[in-house]
């Protein structure tokens, strides 16, 4: 019985060239968190495993880093970063819960003068 | 080349026990999760139990826990399945596999299989 | 327990068919679903993971699709090859379940 549920920053966005943290929190269960997943589209990004830490898919390495916590942040921002981000939860006993979170990403001038979403 | 070669099989009488191992070579035992799946004769497949990587977690199936016991040596290339109080429908041919490091469920390479009998 | 049902249980086709087999789930799974291929007399193989992605050196004529509770694997361009049973796996919750197989023969 899945009664957990995945809290995400939701929408959010950030300028051209700069970082942002992706987060999500289960809550909600006392499930045992074994692993975390952050994909994009279809592309794994990175893994947060319980017994091997994290590992970083080797094509994003120089831009992505791993937390805080489970979290994680994405370096030197292009446009063709703006899309659908996932955090995937494998938990024991619960099963996977999945995260969404759509991050875009705006040229400098826009970021300034009323970004959509704004970053806290 | 992934190699998993599973012994230890055979005739148990029902209440007896048994003890499974899996040599494991041709990739890095201690990075992956590891799984023991049972085939029965009618070509049903279950899965039994699953260990994590650094043996931190396992978990099973109700149909077995409590009288199964997944273990690994990291150092020796090994798994195993101590396997106590058989029953006749644990009569199976066992398989070992290794799980996806991105996918904890998915079984991406499997043993030859070892047969266990179960019967008085 | 999640069950998965297969369908059909086997599967008789011609050499060149297109063929398809479904998979159903008693819940929704989301795309946490794996294909498996057991030759005669041999050990099951990873076929297609995440509902839809080729495990590596899969022959493209294999493609998954599907999510929530309703799957299908279908083989285009039937080889002699690919006489076997099918059996989808779900990895949405524990206990990881299968489906009953489908057996796949040649007319």
């Known amino acids: 019985m899945m009664t957990g549920t995945i809290e995400t920053t939701g929408n959010i966005s950030a300028e051209k060239g700069g970082s942002i943290i992706l987060q999500c929190h289960l809550s909600s269960t006392t499930a045992q968190v074994t692993q975390v997943n952050w994909e994009q589209q279809d592309q794994l990004l990175a893994i947060c495993n319980a017994d091997l830490g994290w590992h970083i898919s080797p094509s994003f390495k120089d831009r992505v880093a791993p937390g805080p916590g489970l979290g994680l942040t994405l370096q030197s921002l292009t446009v063709n970063d703006t899309g659908e981000y996932f955090c995937i939860y494998h938990t024991y006993p619960d099963g996977t819960y999945t995260g969404r979170i759509f991050l875009e990403v705006l040229e400098s001038s826009v970021a300034e003068h009323g970004a959509r979403f704004q970053i806290p | 080349e992934v190699k998993l070669v599973e012994s230890g099989g055979g005739l148990v009488k029902p209440g007896g026990s048994l003890k499974l191992s899996c040599a494991a070579s041709?990739?890095?035992?201690?990075?992956?999760?590891m799984s023991w799946v049972r085939q029965t004769p009618e070509k049903r497949l279950e899965w039994v139990a699953v260990i994590s990587s650094g043996g931190s977690y396992t978990f099973y199936p109700d149909s077995v826990k409590g009288r199964f016991t997944i273990s690994r040596d990291n150092a020796r290339n090994t798994l195993y399945l101590q396997m106590s109080s058989l029953r006749s429908e644990d009569t199976a041919l066992y398989f070992c596999?290794?799980?996806?490091?991105?996918?904890?469920?998915?079984?991406?390479?499997w043993g030859q299989g070892t047969s266990v009998t179960v019967s008085s | 327990d999640i069950q998965m049902n297969q369908s059909p249980s086997s599967l008789s086709a011609s050499l060149g068919d297109t063929i398809t087999i479904t998979c159903h789930a008693s819940q929704n799974i989301n795309v946490w679903l794996s294909w498996y291929q057991q030759k005669p007399g041999n050990i099951p193989k990873l076929l297609i993971y995440?509902?839809?992605n080729l495990h590596t050196g899969v022959p493209s004529r294999f493609s998954g699709s599907g999510s929530g509770a309703g799957f299908t694997l279908t083989i285009s361009s039937l080889q002699p090859e690919d006489i076997a049973t099918y059996y989808c796996q779900q990895g949405q919750s524990y206990p990881w379940t299968f489906g009953g197989g489908t057996k796949l023969e040649i007319k």
């Open positions: 995440k509902a839809s």
């Open positions: 041709g990739f890095a035992f201690s990075s992956f999760d």
């Open positions: 596999t290794r799980q996806d490091y991105r996918y904890p469920y998915i079984m991406d390479y």
